[in-house]
Amino acid sequence: EQAPGTAPCSRGSSWSADLDKCMDCASCRARPHSDFCLGCAAAPPAPFRLLWP
């Protein structure tokens, strides 16, 4: 069980004090007001692949 500040969340995730847990930044599209989404905005997004040539 990770405590805030003891280890960083993995790339593409951010710490939620509300849930006491690292959360996937991808969920911020559906729930933009989640507390961890501020941390996602400050971090680069996870890599994605273009769906067109």
Partner: antibody
Framework: QVSLKESGPGILQPSQTLSLTCSFS??????????VSWIRQPSGKGLEWLAH???????RYNPSLKSRLTISKDTSRNQVFLKITSVDTADTATYYC???????????????WGQGTSVTVSS | DIVLTQSPASLAVSLGQRATISCRAS??????????MHWYQQKPGQPPKLLIK???NLESGVPARFSGSGSGTDFILNIHPVEEEDAATYYC?????????FGGGTKLEIK
């Protein structure tokens, strides 16, 4: 619609292990962000959060009781379990399970609760 | 642990008047952009019911006569105008850190 229902032994003796079951419907504990908590309330007193289990099987416990608590789940059967070892008369209370789930504002506090199951520890 | 102290422990309010319940935290339950305070209503023989989440957001189906405010360590639940069905015990709860804790409750009686 969301519903939760607790079940337990009703009465047990000091030093025994209390086993509680929360059976729920209307949501899935495999949904990202979903979780279930156990909370208790001695008669005429306030609420005490005990433990929480997440969709990914991550668990959290109240430090004051952590050594005595074990929370687990059966996602396919829509059930969450709580075990409390070495019970004493101070563990006499109504035990509730409640859901925390994803919401536009973030992650709901405990928005749906069961009706509670009464547990008496007596010799 | 963050201790939540509610006041008063009980109050009696006349029908149609305002009820104000305070919840004070032993340390801040807010960040610069978020306040992790919630309010519940509990009637005898029933489980708690979520009224307000994250300080001021009314849960779906909760009447607009309920409102919440505050930040940091001081939070308020207001009910105005009070109705007969509001007779209950009200609890604050935080989710700023573990363990999640509840206030001791405020019992509201309608005169």
């Amino acid at each position: 619609q969301v519903s939760l229902k607790e079940s337990g032994p009703g009465i047990l003796q000091p030093s025994q292990t209390l086993s509680l079951t929360c059976s729920f419907s209307g949501f899935s504990l495999s949904t990202s962000g979903m979780g279930v908590s156990w909370i208790r309330q001695p008669s005429g007193k306030g609420l005490e959060w005990l433990a929480h289990i997440y969709w990914d099987d991550d668990k959290r416990y109240n430090p004051s009781l952590k050594s005595r608590l074990t929370i687990s789940k059966d996602t396919s059967r829509n059930q969450v379990f709580l075990k409390i070892t070495s019970v004493d008369t101070a563990d006499t209370a109504t035990y509730y399970c409640a859901r925390r789930g994803p919401d536009y504002y973030g992650y709901y506090p405990m928005d749906y609760w069961g009706q509670g199951t009464s547990v008496t520890v007596s010799s | 642990d963050i201790v939540l102290t509610q006041s008063p422990a009980s109050l009696a309010v006349s029908l149609g008047q305002r009820a104000t319940i305070s919840c004070r935290a032993s340390k801040s339950v807010s960040t610069s952009s978020y306040s992790y305070m919630h309010w519940y209503q509990q009637k005898p023989g029933q489980p708690p019911k979520l009224l307000i989440k994250y300080t001021s957001n009314l849960e779906s189906g909760v009447p607009a006569r309920f409102s919440g405010s505050g930040s940091g360590t001081d939070f308020i639940l207001n009910i105005h105008p009070v109705e007969e069905e509001d007779a209950a015990t009200y609890y604050c709860q935080h989710s700023r850190e573990l363990p999640w804790t509840f206030g001791g409750g405020t019992k509201l009686e309608i005169k």
